[in-house]
Interface confidence: low
Amino acid sequence: EVEKTACPSGKKAREIDESLIFYKKWELEACVDAALLATQMDRVNAIPFTYEQLDVLKHKLDELYPQGYPESVIQHLGYLFLKMSPEDIRKWNVTSLETLKALLEVNKGHEMSPQVATLIDRFVKGRGQLDKDTLDTLTAFYPGYLCSLSPEELSSVPPSSIWAVRPQDLDTCDPRQLDVLYPKARLAFQNMNGSEYFVKIQSFLGGAPTEDLKALSQQNVSMDLATFMKLRTDAVLPLTVAEVQKLLGPHVEGLKAEERHRPVRDWILRQRQDDLDTLGLGLQGGIPNGYLVLDLSMQEALS
């Protein structure tokens, strides 16, 4: 807390300008009117204040707005945003996407800090859902943002927002998250033709069920191995050798390199060896010829 001291004669600030960088902390406290600061916040960012001086300016705003800053001030906080605590931010009511963008810009290139996480949380809760424009903005600044949400939070993403999602935004999503996102993507892209649809849906296929993979195998999509390896094991297991061959197209030879890894490893164990041999890849570990193949799905459902 800065002591209350009288402003020296002639030092009362009439404007927020560069002359203030020469003020000591106590002079800033005594000579800068909080209301003036609030109306000229846009100037603060252009002035090279020290961290200590920014602390004083924050203190003045906190005194002026004990219940939380108005959006007109928040939008122009600039580097002063980095001084805010999550507790400060929880008092705010941020409704403008422009305000959100301005504050995210300040933190650009850094990890998502607790302050930013709180800001985003407040903004999204205020809007009621993750609309397309918000998602577009958040993933532009934080490509991993979508995958940092719980499956429950993702369920509030409307299908229309899926158009804003880029493949790299899904890099760190786990299967449970893709389980939620995939049906939304399927709905969002349902009116596209075959090849265009596959390009868009590809990144979400880690959440696709068996029947959708079977349908894709009939459409000459030529899925690459990187995508195939991200598919749900339980969705891949029921696929026949012929279906996998159609699904992968020319990429089918890549199965050999992946034969020790899930889901390929587990899929091989469920196939007849003579069916695997038709691929000509030397895949081993299938069910020997002449053995009875039980339908394990019912057994698994009962266990």
Epitope: E111, M112, P114, A117, G144, S148, Q168, D171, T172, D174, P175, R176, A226, M229, K230
Partner: antibody, heavy 114, light 108 residues
Framework: QVQLVESGGGLVQPGGSLRLSCAAS????????MHWVRQVPGKGLVWVSR????????TYADSVEGRFTISRDNAKNTLYLQMNSLRDDDTAVYYC???????WGQGTTVTVSS | DIQMTQSPSTLSASVGDRVTITCRAS??????LAWYQQKPGKAPKLLIY???SLESGVPSRFSGSGSGTEFTLTISSLQPDDFAVYYC??????????FGQGTKVEIK
């Protein structure tokens, strides 16, 4: 400040076990995927394993699959690597990595030798 | 599995030199490549991610470029603090992450 501190390394006989720990501070541990990377002294970096934010998804390098187990305790801000059936070629400095690969620990040395 | 090959293995240079290190991927990884710097006895430090994005706090003399299978790390004017080992790392073919074998930048 943002920090990862590994512990639990040491000398162990082939076939033995060790449990490495990595204590995180200064960032929201529960928001990030975490990794273990190892390095034989004088050699290159080798990725070992990763775990997602809530611990439900884990992945391993072929060389350690079935022997090593990665886990995390978000309440304690700690990452673990349980290493069983250790072999001579597991001897290395083990690094804990997080924060989208921007945050690395100082490393802990594991020596497997009879 | 995807292979990452760095060249040269060792590079002798002087302070002020422009230095370029190359990293080749055995298959396309789009722009999913990172560069790290490691000094003796220390942990690696992230310099560049997404092929060309400079990590916060890293001097602007470091830059990255490339896409697909060919990538380069450039140090525009080598400083005394830059003598170290540099590694590339792919994260375009998850779930596996692969590092290059490293390039040692030493004093000429």
């Amino acid at each position: 400040q943002v920090q990862l501190v590994e512990s639990g390394g040491g000398l162990v006989q082939p076939g033995g076990s060790l449990r490495l720990s990595c204590a995180a501070s200064g960032f929201t541990f529960s928001s990030y995927w975490m990794h273990w990377v190892r390095q034989v002294p004088g050699k290159g970096l080798v990725w070992v394993s990763r775990i997602n934010t809530d611990g439900s998804t884990t992945t391993y390098a072929d060389s350690v699959e079935g022997r090593f187990t990665i886990s995390r305790d978000n309440a304690k801000n700690t990452l673990y690597l349980q290493m069983n059936s250790l072999r001579d070629d597991d001897t290395a400095v083990y690094y804990c990595v997080g924060g989208h690969w921007a945050v690395w620990g100082q490393g802990t040395t594991v020596t497997v030798s009879s | 599995d995807i292979q990452m090959t760095q060249s040269p293995s060792t590079l002798s240079a002087s302070v002020g030199d422009r230095v370029t290190i190359t990293c080749r991927a055995s298959q396309s990884i789009s722009d999913r490549l990172a560069w790290y710097q490691q000094k003796p006895g220390k942990a690696p430090k992230l310099l560049i991610y997404k092929a060309s994005s400079l990590e916060s706090g890293v001097p602007s003399r470091f830059s990255g470029s490339g896409s697909g299978t060919e990538f380069t790390l450039t140090i525009s004017s080598l400083q005394p603090d830059d003598f170290a080992v540099y590694y590339c790392q792919q994260y375009g073919h998850l779930p596996m992450y692969t590092f290059g074998q490293g390039t040692k930048v030493e004093i000429k």
